[in-house]
């Protein structure tokens, strides 16, 4: 039997059973999540569940830019440092940078400081690039 690799929407890239869309338009975290959902297929702001996944995403984004942080699907909805992925994935893999997590910073971004391999918390109302993900 020939097993076909699933195809992703135009402009999205495929890695290990998932499709990823990197958007260089500026949205706050909640508007970014709404836009990801609008693409259908069960898309959400991206969960990053392993170092391999993080490295693949970071390499892809670095081909476009190396300075702008990017929203991912990790947030702290209760504002109690109880972080969770918006797509319901288990919060096991963690890649926080050493930056402080205090204040009003309840949404996570891939930080450009370490080539997008580590995360920082930031204020959810900031307008930033964002990364969507779905399983085709």
């Amino acid at each position: 039997d020939i097993i076909m690799r699933p195809s992703c929407a135009p402009g999205w890239f495929y890695h290990k059973s998932n499709c990823y869309g990197y958007f260089r338009k500026l949205r706050n975290w909640s508007d970014a999540e709404l836009e990801c959902q609008s693409y259908g297929n069960g898309a959400h702001l991206a969960s990053i569940l392993s170092l391999k996944e993080a490295s693949t995403i970071a390499e892809y984004i670095s081909g476009y830019q190396r300075s702008q942080p990017i929203w991912i699907g990790l947030h702290d909805p209760q504002k109690r440092q109880q972080w969770q992925w918006i797509d319901g994935a288990m919060y096991l893999y963690r890649s926080w940078s050493g930056k402080s997590m205090g204040g009003n910073k309840h949404c996570a971004e891939m930080s450009s400081n370490n080539n997008f391999l580590t995360w920082s918390s930031n204020e959810c109302n900031k307008r930033q690039h964002f990364l969507c993900k779905y399983r085709p």
């Epitope: 260089r24 338009k25 508007d31 204020e123 959810c124 900031k126 307008r127």
Partner: antibody, heavy 122, light 110 residues
Framework: QVQLQESGPGLVKPSGTLSLTCAVS?????????WSWVRQPPGKGLEWIGE???????NYNPSLKSRVTMSADKSKNQFSLKLSSVTAADTAVYYC???????????????WGQGTLVTVSS | QSVLTQPPSASGTPGRRVTISCSGS????????VNWYQQLPGTAPKIVMY???QRTSGAPDRFSGSKSGTSASLAITGLQSEDEADYFC???????????FGGGTKLTVL
């Protein structure tokens, strides 16, 4: 009630730098808002110059980006605009405004300063 | 030249309905909510409609907003003399990542 007040020279010489400050009262620039500058040449429409967040991150109008610098001073609860290499085409009423996120989606400028006329002339 | 296109003028008699259009593209109106600002002579703009169809608390319920594809419109019913002003549409544009405005429509109440 949030109030914004622009201040700065009303006359700037060509090739000089336009500098304006917006003082915020009744609210904090450290709130989850963007703080923006918009200008309006006499008898014409509105043009967005750019915006700043209290942490210093900025978004600028691409057509003005090379000449614009914005900054925020949390201790004085104010933010500022600098526009370099000005010409007569930069003559306009300059407004500062607060941008708020909508509960549905998007942003809008809900509070504006009264505006200050800056004339570029020798 | 404004990114968003509005008619330069519109008019109506008291009590009638008037509509102001705002035309854009897929990267601005087609992808983002639209705001409408009212500017009375010699004053700063004031938000009257945000997120395309959300009226601000200070705006009369005679004002309504809508959007279809890459065009938006502001409708004012029961036109009153105090509605006479300039109206500007605005939205975010994803292509340059910037706020863009329409050129403005001068509304005259005859």
């Amino acid at each position: 009630q949030v109030q914004l007040q622009e201040s700065g020279p009303g006359l700037v010489k060509p090739s000089g730098t336009l500098s304006l400050t917006c003082a915020v009262s009744g609210g904090s620039i450290s709130s989850s808002n963007y703080w923006s500058w918009v200008r309006q040449p006499p008898g014409k429409g509105l043009e967005w110059i750019g915006e700043i967040y209290h942490d210093g991150s900025t978004n600028y109008n691409p057509s003005l980006k090379s000449r614009v610098t914005m900054s925020a001073d949390k201790s004085k609860n104010q933010f500022s605009l600098k526009l370099s290499s000005v010409t007569a085409a930069d003559t306009a009423v300059y407004y500062c405004a607060r941008d708020s996120p909508s509960y549905s989606s998007g942003w809008y400028s809900d509070y504006w300063g009264q505006g200050t006329l800056v004339t570029v002339s020798s | 030249q404004s990114v968003l296109t509005q008619p330069p003028s519109a008019s109506g008699t008291p009590g009638r309905r008037v509509t102001i259009s705002c035309s854009g593209s897929s990267s601005n109106i087609g992808s983002n909510p639209v705001n409408w600002y009212q500017q009375l002579p010699g004053t700063a703009p004031k938000i009257v409609m945000y997120s395309t169809d959300q009226r601000t608390s200070g705006a009369p319920d005679r004002f309504s907003g809508s959007k279809s594809g890459t065009s938006a419109s502001l409708a004012i019913t029961g036109l009153q003399s105090e509605d006479e002003a300039d109206y500007f549409c605005a939205t975010w544009d994803d292509s340059p990542n910037a706020v863009v405005f329409g050129g403005g429509t001068k509304l005259t109440v005859l």
